[in-house]
Interface confidence: low
Amino acid sequence: SPTPFGPEGQLADELHKPKAIQTEVKPSVRFNLRTSKDPEHEGCYLSLGHSQPLEDCGFNMTAKTFFIIHGWTMSGIFENWLHKLVSALHTREKDANVVVVDWLPLAHQLYTDAVNNTRVVGHSIARMLDWLQEKDDFSLGNVHLIGYSLGAHVAGYAGNFVKGTVGRITGLDPAGPMFEGADIHKRLSPDDADFVDVLHTYTRSFGLSIGIQMPVGHIDIYPNGGDFQPGCGLNDVLGSMAYGTITEVVKCEHERAVHLFVDSLVNQDKPSFAFQCTDSNRFKKGICLSCRKNRCNSIGYNAKKMRNKRNSKMYLKTRAGMPFRVYHYQMKIHVFSYKNMGEIEPTFYVTLYGTNADSQTLPLEIVERIEQNATNTFLVYTEEDLGDLLKIQLTWEGASQSWYNLWKELRSYLSQPHNPGRELNIRRIRVKSGETQRKLTFCAEDPENTSISPGRELWFRKCRDGWRMKNETSPTVELP
């Protein structure tokens, strides 16, 4: 369908029409001041140049002001994540002004047309902010624009066009198509606010990436690598909804950014932490759990401003639902020797035992081949707070790299029935907690018995030297 108001054409004319004529047509961008956390309150519509609604609706000039900006819509109505976000903001910041930017008429278009409308919507927001700045006590530094999907780029335009600098922009899975690789003035970028933080939850290296893959903020956070979100698989969606489809999977992963942000508002006592890393694979190897030199940060609303950083990519794992927080551990396992391993690639499993709880049996994801006579690094994470770790149980299984190798193993076994069992020799495991930054070394319970066959278990306890309390906590990050 054609755009009723082109990006530079009719809507721009519409905005400059005399007031008497303007009221005949519903404005394509409306500003709904949410006066209560209850979604039932219809709120108040603010009108550029009209101070009365500000007074009638109790707009607080000295408080924080949030602008929530929705994205492209197929339905033409507000989606339900919106009232969750409004409610969470009101709960967390009781005196704040929460404004929903309603640009539904311009977003309920063909995607390409909606993209073309983002600039003019950003311009409308900038004009509203310029007008508010004329009021006593209103500070642009107190303004936080929160944009979801296409709305994130709208926020970028608003930040770019406004006179002065907006305090913060949060991009919730900024839209990818038509923005990936675009010039910084045509997408959300770090120049658009004093602090730009971004959550990426639906990025794909191949196929259509609904969310933008490239970093576009001061900090760019990629939960679960920024691609496959737990609880959003087709099976999960089909299980929880009678009408689950691929569309629901897309919605679940794309919208996860919003729910992570809501989680950061309402579960303040369970903050999720992200860790700076050059790429997702290195993070999966457990290499990047440092908090030195601002290398870790809270995600969502609690993120600490790091202006010196530019396009800092950060990663974390999450649960499938609220609260999303998990507890990250780096595990360093030195494999001293293989015995009769052939072509078999070991898969390790650990169970962690702590003062508060015990974990489930956790597989150690192998990103690269297990190296012999070398230290192998892994990332594990638990949904529960285990407290201080007391002991670790380790097992392993042989997983063949190919059917051909499996056949070779079987043939070798059949031709040499008395072939002694395969074994690995592991004497210690070093563990670092991402959340506490504590390091600990675990030694084999029986130093004389450090060899382990498939399916057998080896127990490790804290080494006698105990805790190595290397505190790497950055002063800008308050770790729990």
Epitope: P39, E79, H83, V100
Partner: antibody
């Protein structure tokens, strides 16, 4: 299709409590707030309060806040409204109503549950 | 709390006639919502945001007003329109309803 099915009629003595259920189906339960509205015989409609199934957060009419408790069970997509210290004037039809998209209205209503308070 | 007063309490009209129902708020509200209720049934929304027709509601129903005075108009009464009509506000909690206007056949 969206359906709100309420529990059956109840007869209670003054001072007792009543717990009315409202089972939702045909939509994602946690995405819409649920409200309770009552109507005394031959009288108008009276809003009692609401529950947000996503968080379990509640908002009550001051008039009932000391006597009403709204809860939800996400596993069964059911909301409950319990009214305690019943008096004869609490005799009414109690409706659950789903609050529609964000800045909307009550778009779906339960069939109503008649609660009679009599000694 | 905001008190909504509806008038008249009863409106006796014939099919085909125009019905005008009034709702006055004790203090200013942003928008008004109108519901229709028939005996033994749950209410059904007619008008939201003062003047917007709810899905599936015929165009003979319309709403208007602002501030404290609001009106529901039925341009030409059909037999199925004879019922009780309630106005409601969502501006401030508790969300209140008017006492209702009964539209009956003359």
């Amino acid at each position: 299709q969206v359906q709100l099915v309420q529990s059956g009629a109840e007869v209670k003595k003054p001072g007792a409590s009543v717990k009315v259920s409202c089972k939702a189906s045909g939509y994602t339960f946690t995405e819409y707030t649920m409200h309770w509205v009552r109507q005394a015989p031959g009288q108008g409609l009276e809003w009692m309060g609401s529950i947000n199934p996503y968080y379990g957060g509640t908002s009550y009419n001051e008039k009932f806040k000391d006597r009403v408790t709204m809860t939800r069970d996400t596993s069964t997509s059911t909301v409950y409204m319990e009214l305690s210290s019943l008096r004869s004037e609490d005799t009414a039809v109690y409706y659950c109503a789903r609050y529609g998209n964000y800045v909307g209205y009550f778009d779906y209503w339960g069939q109503g549950t008649t609660v009679t308070v009599s000694s | 709390e905001i008190v909504l007063t509806q008038s008249p309490a009863t409106l006796s009209l014939s099919p085909g006639e125009r019905a005008t129902l009034s709702c006055r708020a004790s203090s200013s509200v942003h928008y008004m919502y109108w519901y229709q209720q028939k005996p033994g049934q749950a209410p059904r929304l007619l008008i939201y945001y003062t003047s917007n027709l709810a899905p599936g509601i015929p165009a003979r129903f319309s709403g208007s007003g602002s501030g404290t005075d609001f009106t529901l108009t039925i341009s030409s009464l059909e037999p199925e329109d004879f019922a009780v009509y309630y106005c409601q506000q969502f501006t401030s909690s508790p969300y209140t309803f008017g006492g209702g206007t009964k539209v009956e056949i003359k």
